[in-house]
């Protein structure tokens, strides 16, 4: 139920990457505004994005308090200019979001190859440890800090002259791989959380190739 000139929000969708988390919904408002509430399963509702005409609300500040909790949000619809108005049941129209557990569901952001260094027939490839918006003791945690050994990286590497992608894996942010002497290689990395059943993989990092600035070559 609700007032005749408001419609309930629908298609409530969580959009989350590396814990930056936004709730999106439809429709674009016509003569109405929205307020969002969020809570954990056992917690109290907290209001965010008061009387907004947007169809999204950044809930990052709330979910980073405990990324392993499961959250529920709801979007209230109010008539524009008359936000005290309620539906026939005595409360404004609202719609619930799906449940969202950040630790299990946030998308893994595109990783970046920080550097690579060749020493003889070995190459050390280092992946940048991306900062998240999750805090502990007033400092922002990295992706590795949050996920620990649950997070692995897959390295794809190939000779510049060929197409077949060899793979290596690490549960740190570094790879040490064997390469053929005198060959140039290209690299791309992918973040993976194997324990998940969905959203297990990130998109691939930009490709970096030997002979470009990021790398360092030392003949031993």
């Amino acid at each position: 139920s609700g007032t005749t000139n408001t419609v309930a929000a629908y298609n409530l969708t969580w959009k989350s990457t590396n814990f930056k988390t936004i709730l999106e919904w439809e429709p674009k408002p016509v003569n109405q505004v929205y307020t969002v509430q969020i809570s954990t399963k056992s917690g109290d509702w907290k209001s965010k994005c008061f009387y907004t005409t947007d169809t999204e609300c950044d809930l990052t500040d709330e979910i980073v308090k405990d990324v392993k909790q499961t959250y529920l949000a709801r979007v209230f619809s109010y008539p524009a200019g008359n936000v005290e108005s309620t539906g026939s049941a005595g409360e404004p129209l609202y719609e619930n979001s799906p449940e969202f557990t950040p630790y299990l569901e946030t998308n893994l952001g595109q990783p970046t190859i920080q550097s690579f260094e060749q020493v003889g027939t070995k190459v050390n490839v280092t992946v940048e440890d991306e900062r998240t918006l999750v805090r502990r003791n007033n400092t922002f945690l990295s992706l590795r800090d949050v996920f620990g050994k649950d997070l692995i990286y897959t390295l794809y590497y190939w000779k510049s002259s060929s197409s077949g992608k060899k793979t290596a894996k690490t549960n740190t942010n570094e790879f040490l791989i064997d390469v053929d002497k005198g060959e140039n290689y290209c690299f791309s990395v992918q973040a993976v959380i194997p324990s998940r059943t969905v959203n297990r993989k990130s998109t691939d990092s930009p490709v970096e190739c030997m002979g470009q600035e990021k790398g360092e070559f030392r003949e031993i």
């Epitope: 692995i152 992608k165 290596a168 549960n171 993976v192 297990r200 691939d204």
Partner: antibody, heavy 120, light 107 residues
Framework: EVQLVESGGGLVQPGGSLRLSCAAS????????IHWVRQAPGKGLEWVGY????????YYADSVKGRFTISAGTSKNTAYLQMNSLRAEDTAVYYC?????????????WGQGTLVTVSS | DIQMTQSPSSLSASVGDRVTITCRAS??????VAWYQQKPGKAPKLLIY???FLYSGVPSRFSGSRSGTDFTLTISSLQPEDFATYYC?????????FGQGTKVEIK
């Protein structure tokens, strides 16, 4: 329940082509990696190649490089093995298998296999 | 490519026997070794991963161990359903490679 079902095997002449399919259910192939492994009659297991369906990256055993191509149709949740210029020594049961993708666990599920016979 | 040399190629044993199969890697593969069981006409099944971890649902009579580049599969007390062929496989580097297999037959 995780399942992999291969199809498309059969009798083919030397120099001919065949396309095998591997239909997956119970998981989304783009979240994992898919391998093809073969086994000649009375012989051991031989790795053929892999695909990461998420990005299309592949790698092949030297014995099939340039002749076999692995692809994936993520909308159909199916992986494929296109085999060209087939030789008698390619006669085998071909298995597709799921790579769990962790540091520890490698192939955790296998299909039932499909027999490819290359003979004139 | 890394070679996995498996031995013996076959063995005969009785129900209740302790059976040991070994695999030697041609270079360091850390613990990235799995063991599979295959019965005639069937697909292989994962028994052991990461050299020594028992896969879900596999009986505890199966165990794996590592010593350097040597890997061992042990069946502590052979059961009738264990007569099969066993393969080791390294997945430390691409391409992954299998051992030649060990056929465990009834004595």
């Amino acid at each position: 329940e995780v399942q992999l079902v291969e199809s498309g095997g059969g009798l083919v002449q030397p120099g001919g082509s065949l396309r095998l399919s591997c239909a997956a259910s119970g998981f989304t192939i783009s979240d994992y990696w898919i391998h093809w492994v073969r086994q000649a009659p009375g012989k051991g297991l031989e790795w053929v190649g892999y695909i990461d369906p998420y990005n299309g990256y592949t790698y092949y055993a030297d014995s099939v490089k340039g002749r076999f191509t692995i692809s994936a149709g993520t909308s159909k949740n199916t992986a494929y093995l296109q085999m060209n210029s087939l030789r008698a020594e390619d006669t085998a049961v071909y298995y597709c298998a799921r790579d769990y993708g962790s540091l520890q666990v490698f192939i955790d599920y296998w299909g039932q296999g499909t027999l490819v016979t290359v003979s004139s | 490519d890394i070679q996995m040399t498996q031995s013996p190629s076959s063995l005969s044993a009785s129900v209740g026997d302790r059976v040991t199969i070994t695999c030697r890697a041609s270079q360091d593969v850390n613990t990235a070794v799995a063991w599979y069981q295959q019965k005639p006409g069937k697909a292989p099944k994962l028994l052991i991963y990461s050299a020594s971890f028992l896969y879900s649902g596999v009986p505890s009579r199966f165990s794996g161990s590592r010593s350097g580049t040597d890997f061992t599969l042990t069946i502590s007390s052979l059961q009738p359903e264990d007569f099969a062929t066993y393969y080791c496989q390294q997945h430390y580097t691409t391409p992954p490679t299998f051992g030649q297999g060990t056929k465990v037959e009834i004595k």
